[in-house]
Interface confidence: medium
Amino acid sequence: LRLLDHRALVCSQPGLNCTVKNSTCLDDSWIHPRNLTPSSPKDLQIQLHFAHTQQGDLFPVAHIEWTLQTDASILYLEGAELSVLQLNTNERLCVKFQFLSMLQHHRKRWRFSFSHFVVDPGQEYEVTVHHLPKPIPDGDPNHQSKNFLVPDCEHARMKVTTPCMSSGSLWDPNITVETLEAHQLRVSFTLWNESTHYQILLTSFPHMENHSCFEHMHHIPAPRPEEFHQRSNVTLTLRNLKGCCRHQVQIQPFFSSCLNDCLRHSATVSCPEMPDTPEPIPDYMPLWEPRSGSSDYKDDDDKGSSHHHHHH
């Protein structure tokens, strides 16, 4: 969590002098309660906005907007604390709006906004706006909270943001997985325009279970420039296990911008429909002579049509 702080943060508006300050998320009014405190924010809204940095990078930001209630408590409103909590890490970042002049009633409802919290693709946040000073112990709460889920990099608008592009969002491998005879899967995917290696992670499962019955990782060497955007074909000859027929194929790139943390794409192959009569096992011999390893496939050939479910 961080602030997009390339320009001075502004909270002033006509009729109000205001400054934005970093906050420890522990306002002084917690420690020294005041007798008179303002009411809570009204109509808290959080939206996904996009902001450019001076360097030209584009980041997703949380646009936080709220209004004040039309009651006399605004006379005691000294500011607001904005808190963003990333739910999966418990990381919290706060800023404080400090009012330098007293609010007056005017015809229009007071409205505030802030769009400088940079958020991460696919993450969920809890956004809280606390009016200051905070309430006395056992006093009515004067904050409002809302959860905010940031779309992941598959989202069209997110895909072109700097964090998504850095993790390989523009690469669409268009994975296809085809079940062949003789316990084979043919995986095909489109290479990106970077000379970097890939890993194919294969996990197989029995028809109705979530215990894996086979796992392996395959290294695909970095393509040459003339292979960029070409299809790479990988044949995986699997362990022959009756029922070990549901395969998840995941492709992990190692682009220079994201290294070990690039977006993975995956496809799954469902178990084939059971035929009424068992298929005969074909006599099968590879066209080439194996050089190393050891051989063993258990049970009948699993034959199935091509399945292709592609996601990040």
Epitope: A182, P206, E209, H211, S212, C213, F214, E215, H216, H218, H219, I220, P221, E227, Q230, S232, N233, V234, T235, L236, T237, L238, R239, N240, L241, K242, C244, P280, I281, P282, D283, Y284, M285, P286, W288, E289, P290, R291, S292, G293, S294, S295, D296, Y297, K298, D299, D300
Partner: antibody, heavy 131, light 107 residues
Framework: QVQLQESGPGLVKPSETLSLTCTVS????????WNWIRQSPGKGLEWIGD???????NYNPSLKSRVTISVDTSKNQFSLKLSSVTTADTAVYYC?????????????????????????WGQGTTVTVSS | DILMTQSPSSLSASVGDRVTITCRAS??????LGWYQQKPGKAPKRLIY???SLQSGVPSRFSGSGSGTEFTLTISSLQPEDFATYYC?????????FGPGTKVDIK
């Protein structure tokens, strides 16, 4: 160098449960299948069953109703339980590893072949079923 | 179950002889077959995997061939340490099954 060592009681009474453990040393139990095989004078070598490190099992249908194979990855061990034993279950019991990977690279396309077979065996433990 | 048969069940040979053992499967098993050597009181030791590939560390006088239903283990020049029992193992389908064995002894 991966080594396997079977352990368990050498004598089991009829109708009781035979329990054996295979300890894997010199390598990880992960990403392999692990087998139990037995050899009795009357029946030759007989495959009992196997287990993947994740817990997924396959059993010989002739023994399936009496066999349980389990794995403890934290101890690098897998175990065999054979219930309701009779004198016909007297045998030398072996544990064995199953699973190797070979890669073949072509131009622009890649072949990954899994060749299996029991390549590493324990030395075997004799179990006698007798009252 | 796939039934594996071996022939001969035993044979007597001399050092330096060429020895051939055959294994047949009751149905096609591609090349999913291994050959094992066992000496008395010892565990089986794999010689050949994938029907024809030599296990690392095994002398080159051992070779395997075949595919589908018929397989052969050949010892090109029998050595004193080769007197043992030889088994084939199919690992094409559950349950894995072994051949009954071929005992090779000194003539």
């Amino acid at each position: 160098q991966v080594q396997l060592q079977e352990s368990g009681p050498g004598l089991v009474k009829p109708s009781e449960t035979l329990s054996l453990t295979c300890t894997v040393s010199g390598g990880s139990i992960s990403n392999y299948y692990w087998n139990w095989i037995r050899q009795s004078p009357g029946k030759g070598l007989e495959w009992i069953g196997d287990i993947y490190y994740s817990g997924s099992t396959n059993y010989n249908p002739s023994l399936k109703s009496r066999v349980t194979i389990s794995v403890d990855t934290s101890k690098n061990q897998f175990s065999l339980k054979l219930s309701s034993v009779t004198t016909a279950d007297t045998a030398v019991y072996y544990c064995a590893r199953d699973g190797e990977l070979a890669n073949y690279y072509g131009s622009g396309s890649y072949q990954f072949y899994y060749y299996y077979g029991m390549d590493v065996w324990g030395q075997g433990t004799t179990v006698t079923v007798s009252s | 179950d796939i039934l594996m048969t071996q022939s001969p069940s035993s044979l007597s040979a001399s050092v330096g002889d060429r020895v051939t053992i055959t294994c047949r499967a009751s149905q096609g098993i591609r090349n999913d077959l291994g050959w094992y050597q066992q000496k008395p009181g010892k565990a089986p030791k794999r010689l050949i995997y994938a029907a024809s590939s030599l296990q690392s560390g095994v002398p080159s006088r051992f070779s395997g061939s075949g595919s589908g239903t018929e397989f052969t283990l050949t010892i090109s020049s029998l050595q004193p340490e080769d007197f043992a029992t030889y088994y084939c193992l199919q690992h094409n389908s559950n349950p894995f099954t072994f051949g009954p064995g071929t005992k090779v002894d000194i003539k």
